[in-house]
Interface confidence: low
């Protein structure tokens, strides 16, 4: 069952899925000039069995003024540059951390993709929150949302994250620790 | 389930000028990519003009391309259509649709690749 909405949004905040749940699928978006080759998936699905788990189809993007040539999915160090969620994928390094049973990992980047990946959640699938550059995090409880089916209908719970304006961002489960909280608790006791 | 509905359709001269606006609820309106399609008396029901998630990507069908401009307010959950130097033969009901498939910069969408349709509102250009 797919989650209706988006999670929440924490103000100064980004969420980013540890891993994602079987069912979910990723829009095959391409950035401006180019377009999904014809013969390609419009979306990539996390598929499998109990054993494991992986993304069906690959995205493709092509130029849209070379009709004929289809771009390999290998990303080019620039284009990886202009996506805007690179800065947090390289700050995760979550997916070759990751195997939970039922799950994918994320999904390398395609060439000129597009900067901004739209993911449609399945109903179980938690996502966690991050303070961006420049904010710290101050927890009342765990900074995640989980997407639930409550009276036929999905919600996402409320992530208890409040970004404030210091300088060290916060940190996904299973990064390493830069210093520790005011409070004491870890940073990265996020996902407990 | 999304639900979309359309306004703004009326009665207006050739050459005059009209807004659609279609109003999107009850999904993540965000992930959708959005698209107006029209059906004339006795005609299929045609491509008009979409837009991506990000409103990078717009599509025009040529009939319409340099008069009518598609654009979408995510805040507002609004997609808008204005309609400019209209036409007798742009008299149809125009359907506000929205899918999560992703738009392509140069492939026009089908109708049959919309999941979500509202009602439509008319509109009629007399000459």
């Known amino acids: 069952e797919l989650c209706d909405d988006d999670p929440p949004k924490i103000t100064h905040a980004t969420f980013k899925a540890v891993a994602y749940k079987e069912g979910t699928m990723l829009n095959c978006e391409c950035k401006r000039g180019f377009r999904r080759i014809k013969s390609g998936s419009p979306y990539m699905l996390c598929t499998g069995n109990s054993s494991h788990s992986s993304w069906d189809n690959q995205c493709q993007c092509t130029s849209s003024a070379a009709r004929n040539t289809t771009k390999q999915v290998t990303p080019q160090p620039e284009e990886q540059k202009e996506r805007k969620t690179t800065e947090m994928q390289s700050q995760m390094q979550l997916a070759d951390q990751v195997s939970l049973p039922g799950h994918c990992r994320e999904p390398p980047p395609w060439e000129n993709e597009a900067t901004e990946r739209i993911y449609h959640f399945v109903v179980g699938q938690t996502v966690y929150y991050q303070c961006v550059q420049g904010y710290r995090a101050l927890h009342r409880g765990p900074a995640e949302s989980v997407c639930k089916m409550t009276h036929g209908k999905t919600r996402w719970t409320q992530p208890q994250l409040i970004c404030t304006g210091e300088t060290e961002p916060s940190q996904f489960p299973g990064e390493e620790e830069p210093q520790a909280s005011p409070d004491g608790l870890p940073e990265s006791e996020t996902s407990r | 389930q999304v639900q979309l509905v359309e306004s703004g359709g009326g009665l207006v001269q050739a050459g005059g000028s009209l807004r659609l606006s279609c109003a999107a609820s009850?999904?993540?309106?965000?992930?959708?990519?959005m698209g107006w399609f029209r059906r004339a008396p006795g005609k299929e029901r045609e491509f008009v003009a979409a837009?991506?998630?990000?409103?990078?990507?717009?599509l025009y069908a040529d009939s319409v391309k340099g008069r009518f401009t598609i654009s979408r307010d995510n805040g507002r959950n609004m997609v808008y259509l204005q309609m400019n130097s209209l036409k007798p033969e742009d008299t149809a009901v125009y359907y506000c649709?929205?899918?999560?498939?992703?738009?392509?910069?140069?492939?026009?969408?089908?109708?049959?690749?919309?999941?979500?349709w509202g009602q439509g509102t008319q509109v009629t250009v007399s000459s």
């Open positions: 009850g999904g993540t309106f965000r992930t959708r990519n």
């Open positions: 649709a929205a899918d999560n498939i992703p738009l392509s910069s140069d492939m026009r969408p089908t109708a049959t690749e919309y999941d979500y």
């Open positions: 837009v991506s998630w990000n409103v990078d990507n717009k």
